[in-house]
Interface confidence: low
């Protein structure tokens, strides 16, 4: 709306940078063959690039990434008892970001 | 996998709390009748609840929200020239979060 501008602060662009995001740990990251288990924790924090660039032809992308292995619990039910095991999930953290030109492929004629 | 756990730190749950997220300001928030304009900035930061709760029957939800009006630029093209106008967009910030029981409606029999 164009009205009620008095109390409104100027909007500030969300710059292209790393921010903390929540990554859901899906069970098939751990075991694709078996569904009879739970994962703990179900989600973790990761660093990801987000935000906007100066025009629509550029996008905020990671310029440097780091793989980070973490240990999660795989909770299986064996003979009606919970059995706590461990598994490794490799997370991707973004360390640096940049506004990168989006190259849209030309349609083949 | 059971191997290569040595270098893996235990995963820490992404707790239910407010985090900074990027909100894309879509043009139809400003003018649904006209597509011949740009918005600046195209995105802003907002505070939103995210993270996991202790079990699947509870979800991370906002327990307190605040509406925040911000001023954006509406850049119209009039006779091939940019015309700068102002508009207000109301953003929703989450101030506090809680793990809330998800009530799934019983199927009607």
């Amino acid at each position: 709306s164009l009205g009620s501008l008095a109390a409104a602060e100027p909007a500030v662009i969300a710059e292209c940078k790393t921010r903390t995001e929540v990554f859901q740990i899906s069970r098939n990251l751990i075991d694709r063959t078996n569904a009879n288990f739970l994962v703990w924790p179900p989600c973790v924090e990761v660093q990801r690039c987000s935000g906007c660039c100066n025009n629509r032809n550029v996008q905020c992308r990671a310029s440097q990434v780091q793989m980070r292995p973490v240990q999660v619990r795989k909770i299986e039910i064996v003979r009606k008892k919970p059995v706590f095991k461990k598994a490794t999930v490799t997370l991707e953290d973004h360390l640096a970001c940049k506004c990168e030109t989006v190259v849209t492929p030309r349609p083949v004629t | 996998s059971l191997g290569s756990l040595a270098a893996a730190e235990p995963a820490v749950i992404a707790e239910c709390k407010t985090r900074t997220e990027v909100f894309q300001i879509s043009r139809n928030l400003i003018d649904r009748t006209n597509a011949n304009f740009l918005v600046w900035p195209p995105c802003v930061e907002v505070q939103r609840c995210s993270g996991c709760c202790n079990n699947r029957n509870v979800q991370c939800r906002a327990s307190q929200v605040q509406m925040r009006p911000v001023q954006v630029r509406k850049i119209e093209i009039v006779r091939k020239k940019p015309v700068f106008k102002k508009a207000t967009v109301t953003l929703e910030d989450h101030l506090a979060c809680k793990c809330e029981t998800v009530v799934t409606p019983r199927p009607v029999t």
């Epitope: 619990r73 008892k81 461990k86 | 756990l5």
Partner: antibody, heavy 120, light 107 residues
């Protein structure tokens, strides 16, 4: 460097009680499951009890169930074993162990142990 | 409860010998089998976890194999510092159980 130091052992009469402590250092204690394992003189290893990182999950050997209680204080980096109704067959060296490996039920670092002697 | 049976209970060997110790579980434990070394008056030391994974810092002459119910610890070339007692342990389910131990002595 991971260090686990047990204390609290000693001579106790049958039916008596003791509380063992295990002071941990050199790792993030609150992130790891911990266990007690015992070894009677000249005998093999016997698992006693395990506690989860947050303390919410505990397991006990049948031989000590109902008599021993495992607990932890993450703010003090300390593991405990409260032993009640002690019997002669509980005589052993009690060691705490950290489970940082492939399952919560293996022991990759051990303390040197503290001797508990149950005798009249 | 899962019983772990180790054999032999003791063996005599010379430096440089290849030594094999076996461990049998009373039911399948997948690959949740660990091997420990204990020297007199010392705390046990983890050698192998998950049946075949070498613990960090353990010499490569130690290796483990097997899955299900039958497992083997092999020392490819026995060294003077390897004379000790070796224990297997299942980490599949509580109650956690150890084998009775195998004492490796100097011939």
């Amino acid at each position: 460097e991971v260090q686990l130091v047990e204390s609290g052992g000693g001579l106790v009469q049958p039916g008596g009680s003791l509380r063992l402590s295990c002071a941990a250092s050199g790792f993030t204690f609150s992130s790891y499951w911990m266990s007690w394992v015992r070894q009677a003189p000249g005998k093999g290893l016997e698992w006693v009890s395990t506690i989860s990182d947050g303390g919410g999950t505990t397991s006990y050997a049948d031989s000590v169930k109902g008599r021993f209680t495992i607990s932890r204080d993450n703010s003090k980096n300390t593991l405990y074993l409260q032993m009640n109704s002690l019997r002669a067959e509980d005589t052993a060296v009690y060691s705490c162990a950290e489970s940082g490996g492939a399952t919560d039920y293996l022991f990759d670092y051990w303390g040197q142990g503290t001797l508990v002697t149950v005798s009249s | 409860d899962i019983q772990m049976t180790q054999s032999p209970s003791s063996l005599s060997a010379s430096v440089g010998d290849r030594v094999t110790i076996t461990c049998r579980a009373s039911q399948s434990i997948s690959s949740y089998l660990n091997w420990y070394q204990q020297k007199p008056g010392k705390a046990p030391k983890l050698l192998i976890y998950a049946a075949s994974s070498l613990q960090s810092g353990v010499p490569s002459r130690f290796s483990g194999s097997g899955s299900g119910t039958d497992f083997t610890l092999t020392i490819s070339s026995l060294q003077p510092e390897d004379f000790a007692t070796y224990y297997c342990q299942q980490s599949y389910i509580t109650p956690l159980t150890f084998g009775g131990g195998t004492k490796v002595e100097i011939k």
